[in-house]
C-alpha cells in the first residue's frame, strides 16, 4: 500500500504565496489568504500568503489601510491571486474601506471594520505565515 499521505482539512484554502517568508514555495494553505503592501525604507514591499489560524487573521484583516501598510484578506482557493493591496491616496480618508473579500458572499459591513486599530508590521505578517 502507498505511503499514508497527510489528511486534507476541509476548512483550509489554497493561497498564492509571494515574498521572502515563502521560501521556495509559491503557495500555502490557511483559513484565510492575504495580499499586503507596506512601505519599507521608501520601497513598496508586496507580499501574499495565508493565515493558518482564523483568529490570527481576524484583526489583521479588519485593520483599515494606513499610509504605510495595507492588507486585504479573502477566503476561497487562490482568492488572493488577483488581489493587489493598495495604500490610501494622500489626503483622502477611507472611512468605509472594505478590505475583506469573501467570494460570492457579501462584503463585511462598515460597522464590522471597527475594533482594535492595530497596525500589523511586515514582521507580524511573516510570523502569521505558513512556511
Amino acid at each position: 500500500m502507498e505511503d499514508e499521505k497527510p489528511k486534507v482539512n476541509p476548512k483550509l484554502y489554497m493561497c498564492v504565496c509571494e515574498g521572502l517568508s515563502c521560501g521556495n514555495e509559491d503557495h500555502c494553505e490557511g483559513q484565510q489568504c492575504f495580499s499586503s503592501l507596506s512601505i519599507n525604507d521608501g520601497f513598496h514591499v508586496y507580499q501574499k500568503g495565508c493565515f493558518q489560524v482564523y483568529e490570527q487573521g481576524k484583526m489583521t484583516c479588519k485593520t483599515p489601510p494606513s499610509p504605510g501598510q495595507a492588507v486585504e484578506c479573502c477566503q476561497g482557493d487562490w482568492c488572493n491571486r488577483n488581489i493587489t493591496a493598495q495604500l490610501p491616496t494622500k489626503g483622502k480618508s477611507f472611512p468605509g474601506t472594505q478590505n475583506f473579500h469573501l467570494e460570492e458572499q457579501k462584503l463585511i459591513s462598515e460597522e464590522d471594520l471597527g475594533g482594535e486599530q492595530k497596525l500589523i508590521s511586515e514582521e507580524d505578517l511573516h510570523h502569521h505565515h505558513h512556511h
Epitope: K7, Q75, E103
Partner: antibody, heavy 119, light 113 residues
Framework: EVQLVESGGGLVQPGRSLRLSCAAS????????MHWVRQAPGKGLEWVSV????????DYADSVKGRFTISRDNAKNSLFLQMNSLRPEDTALYYC????????????WGQGTLVTVSS | DIVMTQSPDSLAVSLGERATINCKSS????????????LAWYQQKPGQPPKLLIY???TRESGVPDRFSGSGSGTDFTLTISSLQAEDVAVYYC?????????FGGGTKVEIK
C-alpha cells in the same frame, strides 16, 4: 462550460481491478481539489475519495481505504481512480466531482460511470 | 464520522404548496471561528447527477430559483421549497463538509400529491 466525463466502468468479477478516468474541461483543472462520489443502484450518495490540486494530500472513505487509489494528471486535465480487490458492495455509479473554491461541496458533477462487481 | 440524518424519507406535496426537508447532523457543523455552517444541499433528478442548490447552509447557488431556501445552524438544518413546481420532483440530499469523511444524508424524495 465546465465538463466532467467519466469512463472506465463495466462489469468485473469480485477480486479483480478496474481503473476509472475523468476528463475535465472548461476550468483551470490544477487549481482545484477533485473528488469521487459513488451511488449504489437505488441508494444514496457516498463520498469515496479526494485528491488536492497538487496531489500532496489525499483521503479515502474507510470502506475503500487500502483498495482504491486516487491520482491525477494535471497536464492532461485528468482524474483517476484505481480500484483493486473489488467487492460486490462496490457496485455503483461513480461520479467525479469538482470542489467549489469556497469549500468542500461540489458545484460540478460528471454523468457517472457504472461499475458492476459480480461473478 | 459525522452522521447526517434526513427526514422524512419521502414527501408528497401539492403543486404550489410548501415542502420542508430536515437534516440533522450527529455533531455540530458550525465552525465558531468564522460562524459558517459547513452544510450543502443538492437536488438529484432521475438519471441525472446531483445539482448544487445551497451551501453554507443558506447561500443559494447562482441560477437556483429563489423558492429554494436553506436555514438552520449547528446540528439542525432545513431545506424549504416555498411553492412546489412540477420540475422540483427529485431526491434532495444534505452534505456536511466540516470534516472528512464527507457525509451525505440518506435523501428525501419529493413527489407531487
Amino acid at each position: 462550460e465546465v465538463q466532467l466525463v467519466e469512463s472506465g466502468g463495466g462489469l468485473v468479477q469480485p477480486g479483480r481491478s478496474l481503473r476509472l478516468s475523468c476528463a475535465a474541461s472548461g476550468f483551470t483543472f490544477d487549481d482545484y481539489g477533485m473528488h469521487w462520489v459513488r451511488q449504489a443502484p437505488g441508494k444514496g450518495l457516498e463520498w469515496v475519495s479526494v485528491i488536492s490540486w497538487n496531489s500532496a494530500t489525499i483521503d479515502y472513505a474507510d470502506s475503500v481505504k487500502g483498495r482504491f487509489t486516487i491520482s491525477r494528471d494535471n497536464a492532461k486535465n485528468s482524474l483517476f481512480l484505481q480500484m483493486n480487490s473489488l467487492r460486490p458492495e462496490d457496485t455503483a455509479l461513480y461520479y467525479c466531482a469538482k470542489k467549489n473554491s469556497l469549500g468542500w461541496f461540489f458545484d460540478y458533477w460528471g454523468q457517472g460511470t457504472l461499475v458492476t462487481v459480480s461473478s | 464520522d459525522i452522521v447526517m440524518t434526513q427526514s422524512p424519507d419521502s414527501l408528497a406535496v401539492s403543486l404550489g404548496e410548501r415542502a420542508t426537508i430536515n437534516c440533522k447532523s450527529s455533531q455540530s457543523v458550525l465552525y465558531s471561528s468564522n460562524d459558517n455552517n459547513y452544510l450543502a444541499w443538492y437536488q438529484q433528478k432521475p438519471g441525472q447527477p446531483p445539482k448544487l442548490l445551497i451551501y453554507w447552509a443558506s447561500t443559494r447557488e447562482s441560477g437556483v430559483p429563489d423558492r429554494f431556501s436553506g436555514s438552520g445552524s449547528g446540528t439542525d438544518f432545513t431545506l424549504t421549497i416555498s411553492s412546489l413546481q412540477a420540475e422540483d420532483v427529485a431526491v434532495y440530499y444534505c452534505q456536511q463538509y466540516y470534516s472528512t469523511p464527507l457525509t451525505f444524508g440518506g435523501g428525501t424524495k419529493v413527489e407531487i400529491k
